[in-house]
Interface confidence: low
């Protein structure tokens, strides 16, 4: 799925108000030292398709996180907010619901969330125009203008 | 543990130029913007401009534009202030400050030790 | 440009008494940070985002505001908390208001 389309000022809303919260209340208990984050994104759209990938996919050792409470808030913003994203996981949530056994929060599961809190940072403060502009602007974003 | 270690004090004459810089250590370089801000003797803090190490885009406080140049160098984990046509009132103490993004806020969490540029001919 | 104007600009108060600083903005921010100050030292992140104390700072602070009026409050004020204040926002080009200093009466 292609996310340059995205509303990503009402996607960062939804990420302040509500899935923010839901990932620390996941990772409660966890220091924020204890893993380094080794996955990163450039801009929104690439922000977001990482996003996507550590949210729904299952990997090797955290095959649960779809369920999460901050999952399911992730889907539902970027359904709303991006055009064209609902079709585009109906055959991928089949799939999940059929890798989906029991609810273990594994330290490899932390890990890949802890990466995800590192991506949503990143989507939250897009960099600097190479222009020198005064306007805080996301370098890859042609169609969408925000102030932070 | 995160740490801004700024360059020694300047001393420069009207219309010459100086150039401060601000080694970062305890973090990833590329993750955070990083501000310059001055103090005058005695006056308020005044932002310069800001940084992104990470593509190296700038944006500056208008009352500088054209004066200051923010540059880094993400080998060595460092950024730079210079500040060309010194006057008199340029004479300050110079600080960086890395800008987090934290509680929903962009804020200056770290900052420099400051580097005190003295005008004067 | 935002302008932040902070007053009173010096507040002259005794160990134990309540401190209010006030900074308004000339127009809307989403939020506002504090920062503390005291003399040939550099400044401290204070408050983050309107309310959220940063790291060691005591629970005798609060802040709290919205829209154009930010407040920070020392409930009762120690000898360490006497330094100079300032205000700062970030969301469009970044700002400080003049700064508050409290004194010690």
């Known amino acids: 799925y292609d996310f340059t389309n995205c509303d990503f000022e009402k996607i960062k809303a939804a990420y302040l108000s509500t899935i923010s919260k839901d990932l620390i209340t996941y990772m409660s208990g966890t220091k924020s030292t204890e893993f380094n984050n080794t996955v990163s994104c450039s801009n929104r759209p690439h922000c977001l398709t990482e996003i996507q990938s550590l949210t729904f996919n299952p990997t090797a050792g955290c095959a649960s996180l779809a369920k999460e409470m901050f999952a399911m808030k992730t889907k539902a913003a970027l359904a709303i907010w991006c055009p064209g994203y609902s079709e585009t996981q109906i055959n991928a949530t089949q799939a999940m619901k059929k890798a989906r056994k029991s609810k273990v929060t594994t330290n490899k599961c932390l890990e890949q969330v802890s990466q995800l809190q590192g991506l949503w940072r990143r989507f939250n403060r897009p960099l600097l125009k190479q222009q020198g502009s005064s306007d805080y602007k996301d370098d890859d974003d042609k169609h969408h203008h925000h102030h932070h | 543990e995160v740490q801004l270690v700024q360059s020694g004090a300047e001393v420069k004459k009207p219309g010459a130029s100086v150039k401060v810089s601000c080694k970062a250590s305890?973090?990833?370089?590329?993750?955070?913007?990083m501000n310059w801000v001055r103090q005058a003797p005695g006056q308020r803090l005044e932002w310069m401009g800001i940084?992104?190490?990470?593509?190296?885009?700038?944006s500056y406080n208008q009352k500088f534009k054209g004066r200051v140049t923010l540059t880094v160098d993400k080998s060595a984990s460092t950024a730079y202030m210079e500040l060309s046509s010194l006057r008199s009132e340029d004479t300050a103490v110079y600080y960086c400050?890395?800008?987090?993004?934290?509680?929903?806020?962009?804020?200056?969490?770290?900052w420099g030790q400051g580097t005190t540029v003295t005008v004067s001919s | 440009e935002i302008v932040l104007t902070q007053s009173p600009a010096t507040l002259s108060l005794s160990p134990g008494e309540r401190a209010t600083l006030s900074c308004r903005a000339s127009?809307?921010?989403?939020?506002m940070h504090w920062y503390q100050q005291k003399p040939g030292q550099a400044p401290r992140p204070w408050i983050y985002?309107?309310?959220n104390l940063a790291s060691g700072v005591p629970a005798r602070f609060s802040g709290s505001g919205s829209g154009t009026s930010y407040t920070l409050t020392i409930s009762r004020l120690e000898p360490e908390d006497f330094a100079v204040y300032y205000c700062?926002?970030?969301?469009?080009?970044?700002?400080f208001g003049g700064g508050t200093k409290v004194e010690i009466k």
């Open positions: 400050a890395r800008e987090d993004y934290d509680y929903d806020g962009y804020a200056m969490d770290y």
């Open positions: 305890g973090y990833t370089f590329t993750d955070d913007y």
């Open positions: 940084i992104s190490p990470y593509n190296g885009g700038t």
């Open positions: 127009s809307s921010v989403s939020y």
């Open positions: 985002a309107t309310s």
């Open positions: 700062q926002q970030s969301d469009n080009v970044r700002g």
